[in-house]
Amino acid sequence: THLGIRLPLRSGLAGPPLGLRLPRETDEESEEPGRRGSFVEMVDNLRGKSGQGYYVEMTVGSPPQTLNILVDTGSSNFAVGAAPHPFLHRYYQRQLSSTYRDLRKGVYVPYTQGKWEGELGTDLVSIPHGPNVTVRANIAAITESDKFFINGSNWEGILGLAYAEIARPDDSLEPFFDSLVKQTHIPNIFSLQLCGAGFPLNQTEALASVGGSMIIGGIDHSLYTGRLWYTPIRREWYYEVIIVRVEINGQDLKMDCKEYNYDKSIVDSGTTNLRLPKKVFEAAVKSIKAASSTEKFPDGFWLGEQLVCWQAGTTPWNIFPVISLYLMGEVTNQSFRITILPQQYLRPVEDVATSQDDCYKFAVSQSSTGTVMGAVIMEGFYVVFDRARKRIGFAVSACHVHDEFRTAAVEGPFVTADMEDCGYNIPQTDESTLMTGRA
């Protein structure tokens, strides 16, 4: 699920101080699998550059070769550069690893734009700023690629954290996280806090660092405020969820909820934007335009192409509405909503006007493959991928960007009937569902 539109940064104030926590439900903690409380060694283990993805440091082989690996919940292959490439400073050298085993099998992954191909093998893998374990995992050694690696991104591979069903070449290739859980006592859960830089970029900061945390094996309470709300994983392929209602500034889009999930809705750390099905996108943009009608912007802005700039510090956040997605809850006829701010869906772009300007792209876009809750959503929240209990949790991120008037929110419960009807049933024909591209 790599490529397409990649990850963003935002502008605004930092999150609330860690001391200012909302009360949690008393029974919540006992329901959480895995270690509880503090995962100090894993906090802040993600890095990246504006628009180029969040990566974690990993080691592969014996002796260990250190590589930066893009964290992608929208795919299921662990794949690393394994041959010289103009955009790679380093790559996996299989011949130098005494523990490499060749599976004598190739893999080819095409995207809407671009592709990668390589050779399958296994080797020993660990995460220095992760759990203190080493596992033997499947590795796709990328030998050829087109429009996959990003110049200057500082990552050399991709860690697909979704399920085996969408692994390439087929679902018999065990994904990394499955191997990790099978070979260790690590609980079958991980969580992501994607933070962004929290400031607009200028020429000297045009490749400013973003940061975040990937907590493997549990939940770190220092990374969120309020309580976690869980939505069921509908099907274990992508991290598929069901959206039951969409609001712009509290105004219901009033669409058949099947439209919101046509043909699926997924949580994907490897996509920048909030991507919406065509009909939903058109309705949402119409509503956002109406809410911000005191100012008009060109069509190219709403298409995510043109930048709109304001004098530094004068971005009129208040004229842009909040976007709320209601997700199916764990209890029958109960939902909860996650609300993002314009600070999430207007993403700062390195200053192409002047250093006195803050410039943004609209980071909600149209999709032909369903809703994709990319970084635009994830940067507002601490997201728990509770694979053990087949659910995804959302709480307000302690590092999300907001202002003094509004904050991202996770709220519930709401009564919503017939939520099962909101899911779209994809006709099963060969591999027609495996649309890998994320344009």
Epitope: S293, T294, E295, K296, F297, P298, D299, G300, F301, E305, Q306, L307, V308, C309, V352, A353, C359
Partner: antibody
Framework: QLQLQESGPGLVKPSETLSLTCTVS??????????WSWIRQPPGKGLEWIGN???????YYNPSLKSRVTISVDTSKNQFSLKLSSVTAADTAVYYC????????????WGRGTLVTVSS | EIVLTQSPATLSLSPGERATLSCRAS??????LAWFQQKPGQAPRLLIY???NRATGIPARFSGSGSGTDFTLTISSLEPEDFAVYYC??????????FGGGTKVEIK
Amino acid sequence: QLQLQESGPGLVKPSETLSLTCTVSGGSISWSSYYWSWIRQPPGKGLEWIGNIYYSGSTYYNPSLKSRVTISVDTSKNQFSLKLSSVTAADTAVYYCARLGHGYNYFDLWGRGTLVTVSS
Amino acid sequence: EIVLTQSPATLSLSPGERATLSCRASQSVSSYLAWFQQKPGQAPRLLIYDASNRATGIPARFSGSGSGTDFTLTISSLEPEDFAVYYCQQVYVWPPRTFGGGTKVEIK
């Protein structure tokens, strides 16, 4: 047919405020499809965008001039105005008003321009 | 800041000849580029928008091409009234603000 016409003094003293008005005729300044703009051109030189205004009063200014520029709109008179404070000889230019059309992107209609000289 | 560089600064040609004017952006502006014509003592006139679309009333001899960083305005056969200064302008960054320095097309 829509037309734009600039008006105002042709001579302004240094440190004073330059004031110009653009009158829109043959159509309404309140059309939602357009922003209204000021652009200037020093003698023998290129074009410099000064700023835009929407009929609602929403403004955008060139960052390099922002501290000295005010653009306002009077929908009842079908006019928009430019004020540039603390002028110097470097502000001597032909000042054009223009319509920003084609989806708010392009200056598709211009006034004839008025020369403003800053001199004591 | 996106800088638009026009070349050549001056183009000396005869009526009936083909004129090719270049505008190069310091970074990609997609296809968000316009061309203007300005005659002495007159306001600029929009010729081309979105890199290749002719504005209303512009003769077919004017054509625009390019995307990304390199753009071209072509006048297929110069008429006497085409001798003027031509400016390009990018609107990738909005509101529109950046003009090129201009190319003067003069009679040889």
